[in-house]
């Protein structure tokens, strides 16, 4: 039975004579007259078992003492710590020549744990042990026993165990304690990697490479490695582990983020408080859940606050100009906590008799600068029908509007367009050109916007450059322009008139009168 004594964490004791209660019972040779087991009191008045020999008067001493079998436990190199006292030969009268002040230390490797005899030739010498401090008769009187401590190591070992032996060649010695141990690098955690107990290498300069395993709730960033030095110290940590998402490092372990905290990625960062308008209800959250009515867009980072759709735009005003409408508004009071606000315009054409019967305006209506994704707070809408009720909705949208669309995010205005002038005439043709006349024909405007009352033809000599022009009016879609000069270039424009007024003039048609009659068709390009 061994009592517990405290030794360094990097030393594993295989034998400690001071921890044995009762007789050690080691084998001595010769059985009598050599090494003798003696119980003495240590400095704390605890009885300890020692081996003593003091045959200093007799020559040719060869006294052996062998320990019990000591298991190797996988160690390749072991250390032997011997605490002993040794009598100064000079303090003993009449022992010159026979008294020695050293003893020899041996070992013998064996797989057999029950060898009964000492066979000297099996043992390998480790070293001759000499005392740094020997004591005299005076020291005995003063009860000052000078304790020597010597440590030797032996290796590499390969068998299951070994025996130690002490050879006395004529000294006066007391072996106060014998401790056999090996060194290990103790289990440790570095950089969130755990390195197991590792027995040191076979020689005093060897380094044992050890791969660490990531602690719970962590993962390798770089392969964690360390080297176990011969002295039982860990050296040169390489690589590391990182706490998983939802976990943070705390005192060398990866602990789950607290409720109300989160960590999105495997990094060396700590958990973070849930962003505004979000929460976590479990430990170990990798993201936080948005509060009711708040959302996170697909490309929003987990660290961003949860946001909501904006409120409606404010102060919508409209300005109707015949069949065009200009709309302007102010930004919403609440942007929902986002910067990516934009505006969409919805146009609905509503029946005059029943405003509730509305339908989309369709593709004929034009929006400047655009209908959707407006970054400015104004839009111009053209090509509407005259005398028609329109409802325009301005929707404020942001990155999370799609998750919770609501009428609360729009503002609307209803307007009635005025009578509009006709659109311009697209095609004017010269049907016949003579020395003194040009016969013109044209198409009705694409959008008459009412009943066309008449057409107006404006013409002038090209050289005069519109400084002196003449006007001809007709209800038909053709006319003969007479009284022209021969061999002269003329420019013609046509426009339509309704009750709402004149439309725009057509593109110019250039025609040159002839010297002889001819039939030609002009399309607004030069005609000769």
């Amino acid at each position: 039975v061994t009592g517990s004594r405290v030794y360094p964490a990097n030393e594993v004791t295989l034998l400690d004579s001071r921890s044995v209660q009762g007789e050690l019972g080691w084998i001595a040779s010769p059985l009598e007259g050599g090494w003798e087991e003696v119980s003495i009191m240590d400095e704390k008045n605890t009885p300890i078992r020692t081996y003593q020999v003091c045959n200093v008067m007799e020559p040719s001493q060869n006294n052996w003492l062998r320990t019990d079998w000591i298991t190797r436990e996988g160690a390749q190199r072991v250390y032997i710590e011997i605490k002993f006292t040794l009598r100064d030969c000079n303090s003993l009268p009449g022992v010159m020549g026979t008294c020695k002040e050293t003893f020899n230390l041996y070992y013998y490797e064996s797989d057999n744990d029950k060898e009964r005899f000492i066979r000297e030739n099996q043992f390998v010498k480790i070293d001759t042990i000499a005392a740094d401090e020997s004591f005299t008769q005076v020291d005995i009187g003063d009860r000052i026993m000078k304790l020597n401590t010597e440590i030797r190591d032996v290796g590499p070992l390969s068998k299951k165990g070994f025996y130690l032996a002490f050879q006395d060649v004529g000294a006066c010695i007391a072996l106060v304690s014998v401790r056999v141990f090996y060194k290990k690098c103790p289990l440790t955690v570095r950089n969130l990697a755990q390195f197991p107990d590792t027995i040191t290498g076979a020689d005093t300069s060897s380094l044992v490479e050890v791969r660490g395993s990531c602690v719970n709730n962590s993962e390798e960033k770089d392969v964690p490695k360390m080297y176990c030095g011969a002295d039982g110290e860990w050296l040169v940590p390489i690589g590391n582990c990182l706490c998983n998402a939802g976990h943070e490092e705390r005192s060398g372990e990866c602990q789950a983020c607290k409720i109300g905290y989160y960590k999105a990625l495997s990094t060396d960062a700590t958990c973070a408080k849930c962003p505004p308008h979000s929460y976590s209800v479990w430990e170990g959250a990798t993201s936080c859940t948005c509060d009711r009515g708040f959302f996170r867009a697909d490309n929003d980072a987990a660290s961003m606050p949860c946001t909501r759709p904006p409120s409606a735009p404010l102060n919508l005003i409209s300005n109707v100009n015949e069949t065009s409408v200009n709309l302007e508004w102010s930004s919403p009071q609440n942007t929902g906590g986002r910067q990516d606000i934009s505006y969409n315009v919805v146009c609905k054409k509503c029946g005059a008799g029943d405003p509730s019967k509305c339908r989309p305006c369709g593709s004929g209506v034009h929006y400047t600068p655009q209908q959707n994704g407006l970054k400015t707070t104004k839009v111009s809408i053209t090509d509407l029908l005259a005398h028609t009720n329109y409802t325009f909705e301005i929707w404020a949208v942001n990155g999370v509007s799609k998750y919770n669309p609501s009428p609360d995010q729009s503002v609307s205005v209803t307007v009635t367009t005025n009578q509009a002038a006709p659109s311009s005439i697209a095609l004017v043709q010269a049907k016949e050109v003579t020395r003194y006349s040009v016969a013109l024909a044209w198409l009705e405007p694409d959008r008459p916007n009412g009943v066309i009352l008449e057409y107006e033809v404006k013409y002038y000599e090209k050289d005069q450059n519109e400084r002196s022009y003449r006007i001809v009016r007709t209800a038909a879609r053709n006319t003969d322009i007479k009284g022209l000069n021969p061999l002269t270039s003329y420019v013609f424009h046509v426009r339509a008139r309704t009750a709402a007024g004149y439309g725009d003039f057509s593109e110019p048609l250039e025609v040159t009168t002839n010297t002889v009659p001819s039939r030609i068709i002009g399309d607004g390009a030069n005609s000769t």
Partner: antibody, heavy 115, light 109 residues
Framework: QSLEESGGRLVTPGTPLTLTCTVS????????MSWVRQAPGKGLEWIGI?????NTYYANWAKGRFTISKTSTTVDLKITSPTTEDTATYFC????????????WGPGTLVTVSS | AIKMTQTPSSVSAAVGGTVTINCQAS????????LAWYQQKPGQPPKLLIY???SLASGVPSRFKGSGSGTEFTLTISDLECADAATYYC?????????FGGGTEVVVK
């Protein structure tokens, strides 16, 4: 949910002493537990913590002087070699699961170290 | 370890009055807001008042208000009552360590 410390008494310097905190109404596998002390007429002093995992962490000044351990329903604080400066009321306290701080305290137990 | 400096060490005010207690950390606390305030009366364990700098603990009157972040924190007690006479402690957390402030004794006249 409650905590109760016990084991406080008069001890001579150098005599190891173990204080026990008995928990009820919650599981020690779900919470980290701290020990805090308060010398007579002085402020509060955090000693250390035992995590749910069983791992421990101590204030710098407390390393080597105290050992925290636990069973399924108790948390122990061992004062390894008390000195007169260790005379204090010792509290065990539960660390909150929602913030860094203690949300539940025991009434404390008085330790007097005197020769 | 983080160091918490609490001022003043003692403060006196009349019933109905207001007191302000300051707590300064030697470095930013965890998350910039992991600071708690406790009230302790003689012979009793500390009682949690405020956590994460400004959140009111359950059952604590709204007369107690916590504010601040990073390294500077304040506990304000308004409409003082006789029952508020106690010692108040801040508790900061950083890098595995907890540290209490030295305490502020509040005397209510």
């Amino acid at each position: 949910q409650s905590l109760e410390e016990s084991g406080g008494r008069l001890v001579t310097p150098g005599t190891p002493l173990t204080l026990t905190c008995t928990v009820s109404g919650f599981s020690l596998s779900s919470y980290h537990m701290s020990w805090v002390r308060q010398a007579p007429g002085k402020g509060l002093e955090w000693i250390g913590i035992i995590y749910r995992s069983g791992n421990t962490y101590y204030a710098n000044w407390a390393k080597g002087r105290f050992t925290i351990s636990k069973t399924s329903t108790t948390v122990d604080l061992k004062i390894t070699s008390p000195t007169t400066e260790d005379t204090a009321t010792y509290f065990c306290a539960r660390e909150s699961s929602t913030f860094y701080g203690m949300d539940l305290w025991g009434p404390g137990t008085l330790v007097t170290v005197s020769s | 370890a983080i160091k918490m400096t609490q001022t003043p060490s003692s403060v006196s005010a009349a019933v109905g009055g207001t007191v302000t207690i300051n707590c300064q950390a030697s470095q930013s606390v965890y998350g910039n807001n992991e600071l708690a305030w406790y009230q302790q009366k003689p012979g009793q364990p500390p009682k949690l008042l405020i956590y994460t700098a400004s959140s009111l603990a359950s059952g604590v009157p709204s007369r107690f208000k916590g504010s601040g972040s990073g390294t500077e924190f304040t506990l304000t007690i308004s409409d003082l009552e006789c029952a508020d006479a106690a010692t108040y402690y801040c508790l900061g957390y950083k890098s595995d360590d907890y540290t209490f402030g030295g305490g502020t004794e509040v005397v209510v006249k």
